[in-house]
């Protein structure tokens, strides 16, 4: 029986060109985490295997860094990075737990634009 719960960073936003940390945390279970998959909508971003360590998908290796912990750091964000991200915890003996994060990548902040065109 699955007793654990996944906590995530939920709905988050970040600026274009910046970076963001995606974090999930599995609690309330003594199940052993054997692997964590990070998926972006419909493609695999990275895998953290308890025995083999991290594997970053080749198409993302320039922009994705492992960690902190079982989380994932996305760098050089573009508006195309907007969307759903899933952390999938493979555990024994519980099975899989899934968490969802929605990332919105924004153009430079209004505050920055405002400062740039401020009337002296």
């Amino acid at each position: 029986m699955m007793t654990g719960t996944i906590e995530t960073t939920g709905n988050i936003s970040a600026e274009k060109g910046g970076s963001i940390i995606l974090q999930c945390h599995l609690s309330s279970t003594t199940a052993q985490v054997t692997q964590v998959n990070w998926e972006q909508q419909d493609q695999l971003l990275a895998i953290c295997n308890a025995d083999l360590g991290w594997h970053i998908s080749p198409s993302f290796k320039d922009r994705v860094a492992p960690g902190p912990g079982l989380g994932l750091t996305l760098q050089s964000l573009t508006v195309n990075d907007t969307g759903e991200y899933f952390c999938i915890y493979h555990t024994y003996p519980d099975g899989t737990y899934t968490g969802r994060i929605f990332l919105e990548v924004l153009e430079s902040s209004v505050a920055e634009h405002g400062a740039r065109f401020q009337i002296p």
Partner: nanobody, 116 residues
Framework: EVQLVESGGGLVQPGGSLRLSCAAS????????MGWFRQAPGKEREWVAS????????YYADSVKGRFTISADNSKNTAYLQMNSLKPEDTAVYYC?????????WGQGTLVTVSS
């Protein structure tokens, strides 16, 4: 203009089943992901399931995994949520949305009540 129309809700006994439909228009269905969300009385809206056409990947919240199945028919621009083994805690208004959009276009939702 994006339009999403949910249907199929109703009153069902615990352990029963329902199939929700979401008819979508105003965007290219096959290039998108679609998601189902729900909002129970006095609670925040929560994600239930998502499907992506390009890969066929499906994702489920742990609370519905093994009981709910998300699917889609591209030719009809319609997404579905098959809900089995319903529990009282599944009672909520169910909404569909284009999962890729930062600002979701919500439909009116469809009410699912699970009660004996």
């Amino acid at each position: 203009e994006v339009q999403l129309v949910e249907s199929g809700g109703g009153l069902v006994q615990p352990g029963g089943s329902l199939r929700l439909s979401c008819a979508a228009s105003g965007f290219t269905f096959s290039n998108s992901g679609m998601g189902w969300f729900r909002q129970a009385p006095g609670k925040e809206r929560e994600w239930v399931a998502s499907i992506y056409w390009s890969s066929g990947n499906t994702y489920y919240a742990d609370s519905v995994k093994g009981r709910f199945t998300i699917s889609a028919d591209n030719s009809k621009n319609t997404a579905y949520l098959q809900m089995n083994s319903l529990k009282p805690e599944d009672t909520a208004v169910y909404y569909c949305a284009n999962s890729n959009k930062p600002k979701f276009d919500w439909g009116q939702g469809t009410l699912v009540t699970v009660s004996s």
